[in-house]
């Protein structure tokens, strides 16, 4: 029988034993930074090369007894999850192990840094195919460890790490908090976040996705043919490292940004019970469980987008929050969210030659989040067009006036503390899809992009009576690039994209005493690329 | 040579106290620093520390990913180390754990 975790990551309509070929991931090398491992275990023999790298602290305690099987336990299991012959995800992937954790599973930031440097030097001396680095470890937030991960990622290496087992915000830990790293939380057979004793999987905006991480069967270092069940975000990260190896083996030219977008795209959506997470983290935590793509062929024709949340701005009057896309992603839209509803909107602005999404807190607000919609759009040329507050009853409007440019997102930003709520909602005049409309006291920013074959359309869903949540989704074949609310009045908490759905949140009606005239409309901009679709068809 | 005007090197340490490893520090140098400069900066720290009666040990010189070095020294020397040329920031070593 197939272990539940391998079944779970196999796409529907496939059997896991058919789907996971013995050579899956064979073009990829996976580096494992962990404990020592039993590399001659039947599950992994010939698949794992133990490097001579070792940088570990002394074990704690005077009476510590160094028992080989205990020393090897964590690393052996993870190597088995990645590439084990019976219970591995990428059965053909070859692995290299570096020892950075001692027999108690403890290491240092400096030892991990030296390990990452060792990998970079090995890559320079003997360039091979795609590299995946698995970091099944966590420490407190570390600027230097995050910086090293960033450098290695920019050298073309895919880094996958454990979100951490502290039932806490993953952004407080490293390398989980490094934006360039793929950070993985753990779920169980019931798609619940994993509880580990009194703690459990980490969560929050620094988690990219979840993967199976409870009762995972893998190689046991107790004997050369033994198996054992282990749990943790390390096991979850090992699944994603295996899936990444499979994807990179099928498409070796994938960049880190393309790989991350595909991992998100092929994940199971909205299956995790979010009630397990603290209330303030639910909206920030991705509801995604990793899965293998349904085909080993590329999905190059898709327009891939993901949502990136900023850190919380903090409560000061002038506080702002910034959300950034990865270097080879395009920022196609920008929105903001505040739990108190006190915000001054958001704007797209250039920073270091790249667009970022900045959200503004308002006086008395508890803080805001900026939400960037980051997409893979080859040969894109995007710019932001701004209209200052119109002060006219018609409201402010801005459109994409350059030839061949299409509207991908709308943002609005206001200087006044409170946009009037008594004004009637502004409705978009029909037949003008290429423009953003907003409150007359707000500046409106349109994201306008030119890319081969890019086409976009506006989709709206308005509810006459105020609701806590209004949603509008893009249909099959279209990708959500922009999500905003009409009007931008103060009872709107904000707008954000969840997968292909635009969500607009309003304050609880019972506490605001709102009237029915304050209807809220969710405005989605849905795009697709005919160019990518054609290119894909020509390849096949 | 003093650090460039207006750029002050900063010190970082783990927010979780039990995970701190005081006495070992990663000195991170500015992005374009060459290996020879890293080695020179490390030697300079050792020399200045010795003049004050402190023993230091350079455990590793980084290059390839980040320029810098790993040093075993007293925390009393941090102020001195932060004033060295090319220094971007210094981070106290800390523990990481299998997850």
């Amino acid at each position: 029988s197939i272990p539940w975790n391998l079944e779970r990551i196999t796409p529907p309509r496939y059997r896991a034993d058919e789907y996971q070929p013995p050579d899956g991931g064979s073009l990829v090398e996976v580096y494992l930074l962990d404990t020592s491992i039993q590399s001659d275990h039947r599950e992994i023999e010939g698949r794992v090369m133990v490097t001579d790298f070792e940088n570990v602290p002394e074990e704690d305690g005077t009476r510590f007894h160094r028992q080989a099987s205990k020393c090897d336990s964590h690393g052996t299991h993870l190597a088995g999850v990645v590439s084990g012959r019976d219970a591995g995800v990428a059965k053909g992937a070859s692995m290299r192990s570096l020892r950075v954790l001692n027999c108690q599973g403890k290491g240092t930031v400096s030892g991990t840094l030296i390990g990452l440097e060792f990998i970079r030097k090995s890559q320079l001396v003997q360039p091979v195919g795609p590299l995946v680095v698995l970091l099944p470890l966590a420490g407190g937030y570390s600027r230097v460890l995050n910086a090293a991960c960033q450098r290695l990622a920019r050298a073309g290496v895919v880094l996958v790490t454990a979100a951490g087992n502290f039932r806490d915000d993953a952004c407080l830990y490293s390398p989980a908090s490094a934006p360039e790293v793929i950070t993985v939380g753990a779920t169980n057979a019931q798609d619940q976040p994993v509880t580990l004793g009194t703690l459990g999987t980490n969560f929050g905006r620094c988690v990219d996705l979840f993967a199976p991480g409870e009762d995972i069967i893998g190689a046991s270092s107790d004997c050369s043919t033994c198996f054992v069940s282990q749990s943790g975000t390390s096991q979850a990260a090992a699944h994603v490292a295996g899936i990444a190896a499979m994807m990179l083996s099928a498409e070796p030219e994938l960049t880190l940004a393309e790989l991350r977008q595909r991992l998100i795209h092929f994940s199971a959506k909205d299956v995790i019970n979010e009630a397990w997470f603290p209330e303030d983290q639910r909206v920030l935590t991705p509801n995604l469980v990793a899965a293998l793509p349904p085909s080993t062929h590329g999905a190059g024709w898709q327009l891939f987008c993901r949502t990136v949340w900023s850190a919380h701005s903090g409560p000061t009057r002038m506080a702002t929050a910034i959300a950034r896309c990865a270097p080879d992603e395009e920022l196609l839209s920008c929105s903001s969210f505040s739990r108190s509803g006190k915000r001054r909107g958001e704007r797209m602005e250039a920073q270091g030659g790249k667009l970022v999404c900045r959200a503004h807190n308002a006086f008395g607000g508890e803080g805001v989040y900026a939400i960037a919609r980051c997409c893979l759009l080859p040969q894109a040329n995007c710019s932001v067009h701004t209209a200052p507050p119109a002060e006219a009853s018609m409201g402010t409007r801005v459109h994409c006036h350059q030839q061949g440019h299409v509207l991908t997102g709308c943002s609005s930003h206001w200087e006044v503390e409170d946009l009037g709520t008594h004004k009637p909602p502004v409705l978009r005049p029909r037949g003008q899809p290429n423009q953003c409309v907003g409150h007359r006291e707000a500046s409106i920013h349109a994201s306008c992009c030119h890319a081969p074959g890019l086409e976009c359309k506006v989709k709206e869903h308005g509810i006459p009576a105020p609701q806590e949540q209004v949603t509008v989704a893009c249909e099959e074949g279209w990708t959500l690039t922009g999500c905003s609310a009409l009007p931008g009045t103060s009872h709107v908490l904000g707008a954000y994209a969840v997968d292909n759905t635009c969500v607009v949140r309003s304050r609880d009606v019972s506490t605001t005493g709102s009237t029915s005239e304050e209807a809220v409309t969710a405005v989605a901009i849905c795009c697709r690329s005919r160019h990518l679709a054609q290119a894909s068809q020509e390849l096949q | 040579e003093a650090p460039e005007h207006g750029t002050t090197a900063t010190f970082h340490r783990c927010a979780k106290d039990p995970w701190r490893l005081p006495g070992t520090y990663v000195v991170v140098l500015k992005e374009e620093t060459h290996l020879s400069q890293s080695e020179r900066t490390a030697r300079r720290l050792q020399a200045q520390a010795a003049r004050r009666g402190y023993l230091t040990k350079i455990l590793h010189v980084f290059h390839g990913l980040l320029p810098g070095f790993l040093v075993k020294m007293s925390g009393d020397l941090l102020e001195l180390a932060l004033k060295l040329p090319h220094v971007d920031y210094i981070e106290e070593d800390s523990s990481v754990f299998a997850q």
């Epitope: 013995p22 001659d40 039947r42 023999e45 090369m49 043919t225 | -």
Partner: antibody, heavy 115, light 107 residues
């Protein structure tokens, strides 16, 4: 290149012991254990067990339990298979092979048990 | 232990012939089946692992197929150096067990 070189032929009396050696070279020793397989004259192949270079762990076939001992000496990259209380039906060619995958084989050691 | 049964136990063929040897397991072994070639007085040599994967250096005329309990080794065009005994071996469970062998002789 990757190779396993075994010790020479042995002739033993019933009740005696024999120790066959297998020297490995050309690959990362700790990444594979050594399997032992025997083949009686005109017969098929029979797996006897496996031993680890990494930690000395063993995995014996049930038929061998108690009579055989497999060991390794990583310092000389050599694996050993000792068979005690030899009987005439232990007459066979004894092979060592790399790992459980048995992708590389030694040349074989003929052990003859005869009174 | 899993029993492995090979057929035929021997066969005669000519150079250039297509030869097929079958192997049946007493229970499902997924794709964990290896094929070995053994020449007189020599050690066995791995020809196919995991039912269908050829190690580097093995000529492409050798191919393997099957999964579950029924497996086949095919030599597409028999060459003079292919006259030998062929063994299948299951690698699913410990202990690994071998078929009794198929001797391929010159007609």
């Amino acid at each position: 290149q990757v190779q396993l070189v075994q010790s020479g032929a042995e002739v033993k009396k019933p009740g005696a012991s024999v120790k066959v050696s297998c020297k490995a070279s050309g690959y990362a020793l700790y990444n594979y254990g050594i399997s032992w397989v025997r083949q009686a004259p005109g017969q098929g192949l029979e797996w006897m067990g496996w031993v680890s270079f990494y930690n000395g762990n063993t995995n014996y076939a049930q038929k061998l339990q108690g009579r055989g001992t497999m060991t390794t000496d990583p310092s000389t990259s050599t694996a050993y298979m000792e068979l005690r209380s030899l009987r005439s039906d232990d007459t066979a060619v004894y092979y060592c092979a790399r790992g459980y995958v048995m992708d590389i084989w030694g040349q074989g050691t003929t052990v003859t048990v005869s009174s | 232990d899993i029993q492995m049964t090979q057929s035929p136990s021997s066969l005669s063929a000519s150079v250039g012939d297509r030869v097929t040897i079958t192997c049946r397991a007493s229970q499902s072994i997924n794709n964990w089946l290896d094929w070995y070639q053994q020449k007189p007085g020599k050690a066995p040599k791995l020809l196919i692992y995991a039912a269908s994967t050829r190690p580097s250096g093995v000529p492409s005329r050798f191919s393997g197929s099957g999964s579950g309990t029924d497996f086949t080794l095919t030599i597409s065009s028999l060459q003079p150096e292919d006259f030998a005994t062929y063994y299948c071996q299951q690698d699913q469970d410990i202990p690994p067990t071998f078929g009794q062998g198929t001797k391929v002789e010159i007609k």
